[in-house]
């Protein structure tokens, strides 16, 4: 029978027949930076080329005995998870191993850097097809390791890393905290975050998605036909490296940004019990478990978006937080969130020739998050239109006036410490869908984009009595690009997108003594690309 | 992430001391920073990654490394260049006393210096 972890990442339509094409991942080379490996294991024999690269520290302790089976344990298992004959994800992928971890599983940042440099030089000397680099290791936050990962990613390499097994915020570890790297947390057979004794998966905004990482049966270095169970975020990262190899083999031209968006898109949504995560991390941690796409070809017609959370701004009066999209992505909307509700909104602004999302803390606030909605929109031309505070009773309005530009997101930002209660009499006059409406004391920012075949519509869900959470979702075939709250009054904690749903959070009604005047509306902007859909149909 | 290195616990020392005399002063208005792992048991003092500014060529990296060695020697310190980086990041890996950090931070082309630290299989 198929092991639980392979079943979990396999879409239902594969399961009845065969798990996957036998040559899955054959066009892709996966580099593994880990311990030494037992390359003659039945699972990986002929699939893994052991490079001559080795940069490891001495083992600790005077009585340490280098036993080959112990030295090779971690790397052999991971190579098996990626491409093993029986228990591998991408059975067709070829692998190259670099030894950066010693027999105790310990390495150095410098050794890892030199390993990454070795890969880059190999790529330059002998360009091959798509490259995936698996980094099943973690150290403390390292500016230099993150920088090296960024450079390699910008050279077209897909890097996948373990979130870490420290039951902690992944942002405190490297390379897990590098934005360009695909960072993977671990879940078990019950789709729960992995906890084993005092260890457990890391979490937080630096995790991109989760994957199976507990009780994973794979190649054991104890003998050439042995198998063993190993657990951890390394095993989870190996699953995602395998899935990435499968996707890249099917579509070798995929960029890192496209691959990441597809990994997110095809993941199982909302299956993880978030109660396991610390309360302040739940909203930041993606509720996604990786899976293979239902068919090896084509999701090209879809408009893909993901949500990117900033680091916390900190509590000072003028503190701001910035969320950025990847270089190939477009920032289509920007929102903000504060647990205390004390914030001064958010705005989209240009920084280094690219739009970023900046959120503003308010006096007495504990800090804010900026939340960017980052999308793949080829040939897009986006700009931000701003209307200053109107001061009029009708509220502030701004719309997309350029021909062919559509509204993808609304943001509002205010200088006053506390917006008074204000309910615009008309939320959105008929016939003016390209319009953002907001509080009269706020500046309103509209994200307006022109892209071939792009069409968008506004969806609202208002609840007359205040609720702690109001949501509105885009229907099948449409993608959420913008998420905001109306009105922007002080009891609104903020708005953010979770998959295709816009979530607006308000303060606990019982403590605020809110009146029905302060009803909250969640405003979603849903878009689709007719151009991408047509292009996809023409290909078929 | 992003420009938020300061948001993390790792120690960032901007060492602005008097000019060394032997070193060229770094470009006006920029100060190289020193970073180390926030998790003390994972630190590996005595080995440092000296990262140079983005457009620095390999020859300049080698020259900067040699200059550090020469200046350290004048002060009676032994240093060893373990690796010169190029291809991903310009810079070099050096084994030296932490006493030389102040000197190293003032070398031309230096962007930042990071103390080496441990990574672990996960």
């Amino acid at each position: 029978s198929i092991p639980w972890n392979l079943e979990r990442i396999t879409p239902p339509r594969y399961r009845a027949d065969e798990y996957q094409p036998p040559d899955g991942g054959s066009l892709v080379e996966v580099y593994l930076l880990d311990t030494s490996i037992q390359s003659d294991h039945r699972e990986i024999e002929g699939r893994v080329m052991v490079t001559d690269f080795e940069n490891v520290p001495e083992e600790d302790g005077t009585r340490f005995h280098r036993q080959a089976s112990k030295c090779d344990s971690h790397g052999t298992h991971l190579a098996g998870v990626v491409s093993g004959r029986d228990a591998g994800v991408a059975k067709g992928a070829s692998m190259r191993s670099l030894r950066v971890l010693n027999c105790q599983g310990k390495g150095t940042v410098s050794g890892t850097l030199i390993g990454l440099e070795f890969i880059r030089k190999s790529q330059l000397v002998q360009p091959v097809g798509p490259l995936v680099v698996l980094l099943p290791l973690a150290g403390g936050y390292s500016r230099v390791l993150n920088a090296a990962c960024q450079r390699l990613a910008r050279a077209g390499v897909v890097l996948v890393t373990a979130a870490g097994n420290f039951r902690d915020d992944a942002c405190l570890y490297s390379p897990a905290s590098a934005p360009e790297v695909i960072t993977v947390g671990a879940t078990n057979a019950q789709d729960q975050p992995v906890t084993l004794g005092t260890l457990g998966t890391n979490f937080g905004r630096c995790v991109d998605l989760f994957a199976p990482g507990e009780d994973i049966i794979g190649a054991s270095s104890d003998c050439s036909t042995c198998f063993v169970s190993q657990s951890g975020t390394s095993q989870a990262a190996a699953h995602v490296a395998g899935i990435a190899a499968m996707m890249l083999s099917a579509e070798p031209e995929l960029t890192l940004a496209e691959l990441r968006q597809r990994l997110i898109h095809f993941s199982a949504k909302d299956v993880i019990n978030e109660a396991w995560f610390p309360e302040d991390q739940r909203v930041l941690t993606p509720n996604l478990v990786a899976a293979l796409p239902p068919s090896t070809h084509g999701a090209g017609w879809q408009l893909f978006c993901r949500t990117v959370w900033s680091a916390h701004s900190g509590p000072t009066r003028m503190a701001t937080a910035i969320a950025r999209c990847a270089p190939d992505e477009e920032l289509l909307s920007c929102s903000s969130f504060s647990r205390s509700g004390k914030r001064r909104g958010e705005r989209m602004e240009a920084q280094g020739g690219k739009l970023v999302c900046r959120a503003h803390n308010a006096f007495g606030g504990e800090g804010v998050y900026a939340i960017a909605r980052c999308c793949l929109l080829p040939q897009a031309n986006c700009s931000v239109h701003t209307a200053p505070p109107a001061e009029a009773s009708m509220g502030t309005r701004v719309h997309c006036h350029q021909q062919g530009h559509v509204l993808t997101g609304c943001s509002s930002h205010w200088e006053v410490e506390d917006l008074g209660t204000h309910k615009p009499p008309v939320l959105r006059p008929r016939g003016q869908p390209n319009q953002c409406v907001g509080h009269r004391e706020a500046s309103i920012h509209a994200s307006c984009c022109h892209a071939p075949g792009l069409e968008c519509k506004v969806k609202e869900h208002g609840i007359p009595a205040p609720q702690e959470q109001v949501t509105v979702a885009c229907e099948e075939g449409w993608t959420l690009t913008g998420c905001s709250a109306l009105p922007g009054t002080s009891h609104v904690l903020g708005a953010y997108a979770v998959d295709n749903t816009c979530v607006v959070r308000s303060r606990d009604v019982s403590t605020t003594g809110s009146t029905s005047e302060e009803a909250v509306t969640a405003v979603a902007i849903c878009c689709r690309s007719r151009h991408l859909a047509q292009a996809s149909q023409e290909l078929q | 992430q992003e420009d938020e290195d300061g948001d993390y616990e790792e120690l960032v020392l901007a060492l602005r001391s008097e000019e060394d005399g032997l070193a060229e002063a770094p470009e006006h208005g920029t100060t190289a920073t020193f970073h180390r792992c926030a998790k003390d048991p994972w630190r590996l003092p005595g080995t440092y990654v000296v990262v140079l500014k983005e457009e620095t060529h390999l020859s300049q990296s080698e020259r900067t490394a040699r200059r550090l060695q020469a200046q350290a020697a004048r002060r009676g310190y032994l240093t060893k260049i373990l690796h010169v980086f190029h291809g991903l990041l310009p810079g070099f890996l050096v084994k030296m006393s932490g006493d030389l950090l102040e000197l190293a931070l003032k070398l031309p082309h230096v962007d930042y210096i990071e103390e080496d630290s441990s990574v672990f299989a996960q």
Partner: antibody, heavy 128, light 107 residues
């Protein structure tokens, strides 16, 4: 469905060797840790030792000098030998599978999910 | 070796009762503890591992708690098929050791 079946003589003379075999069906023997336990009449359970597919063994110190566990991978079987038996070795002998996983943080940890599959047990009486 | 002690050794209860069995370890075993049910003439059956994780297929009326040196097995509403002997076992180190057992009898 994994099943374990113990087999061997039900009667052994004092000072002789007790030999039992456990046959694993429905799963390969090459992954888990395979243990032997015993339970004297009306008493509690005692762990004897385990063997892993590679041949690694671990025995209870109280029995270490007398016990040997071996594995026959082609047959998907593992065996127990206990020498110099006495009446105190009279018990129901069980074989069982222990599921163990490894996880790493700064060092390597072994984590057990317990003995999740057991044989039905075989009674061995030591008597002349 | 780690010594495991169970209390009580015998327990009389009726169907529908809430039953609690306690197990102590002679040293800290974190949450590395399993509970087994054994009926006469039958092999033990794993109920709970990691002190509180229910083994697949075990009814949810069984629950485990505790960490360190003190652990509890709770049966929220005793069913006729639950009359048996229950053992705790430490999974922290070898040799694996068991408690002496708690026999749950019909009152």
């Amino acid at each position: 469905q994994v099943q374990l079946q113990e087999s061997g003589p039900g009667l052994v003379k004092p000072s002789e060797t007790l030999s039992l075999t456990c046959t694993v069906s429905g799963d390969s023997i090459n992954t888990y840790y395979w243990s032997w336990f015993r339970q004297p009449p009306g008493k509690g359970l005692e762990w004897i030792g385990y063997i892993y597919y590679s041949g690694t063994t671990n025995y209870n110190p109280s029995l270490k000098s007398r016990v040997t566990i071996s594995i026959d991978t082609p047959r998907n079987q593992f065996s127990l030998k206990l020498i110099s038996v006495t009446a105190a070795d009279t018990a129901v002998y069980y074989c069982a599978r222990e599921r163990i996983t490894m996880i790493r943080g700064v060092t390597l940890y072994y984590y057990s999910y317990g003995m999740d599959v057991w044989g039905q047990g075989t009674t061995v009486t030591v008597s002349s | 070796d780690i010594q495991m002690t169970q209390s009580p050794s015998f327990l009389s209860a009726s169907v529908g009762d809430r039953v609690t069995i306690t197990c102590w370890a002679s040293q800290d075993i974190s949450s590395y503890l399993a509970w087994y049910q054994q009926k006469p003439g039958i092999a033990p059956k794993l109920l709970i591992y990691a002190a509180s994780t229910l083994q697949s297929g075990v009814p949810s009326r069984f629950g485990g708690s505790g960490s360190g040196t003190e652990f509890t097995l709770t049966i929220s509403s005793l069913q006729p098929e639950d009359f048996a002997t229950y053992y705790c076992q430490q999974l922290n180190s070898y040799p694996r050791t068991f408690g002496q057992g708690t026999k749950v009898e019909i009152k």
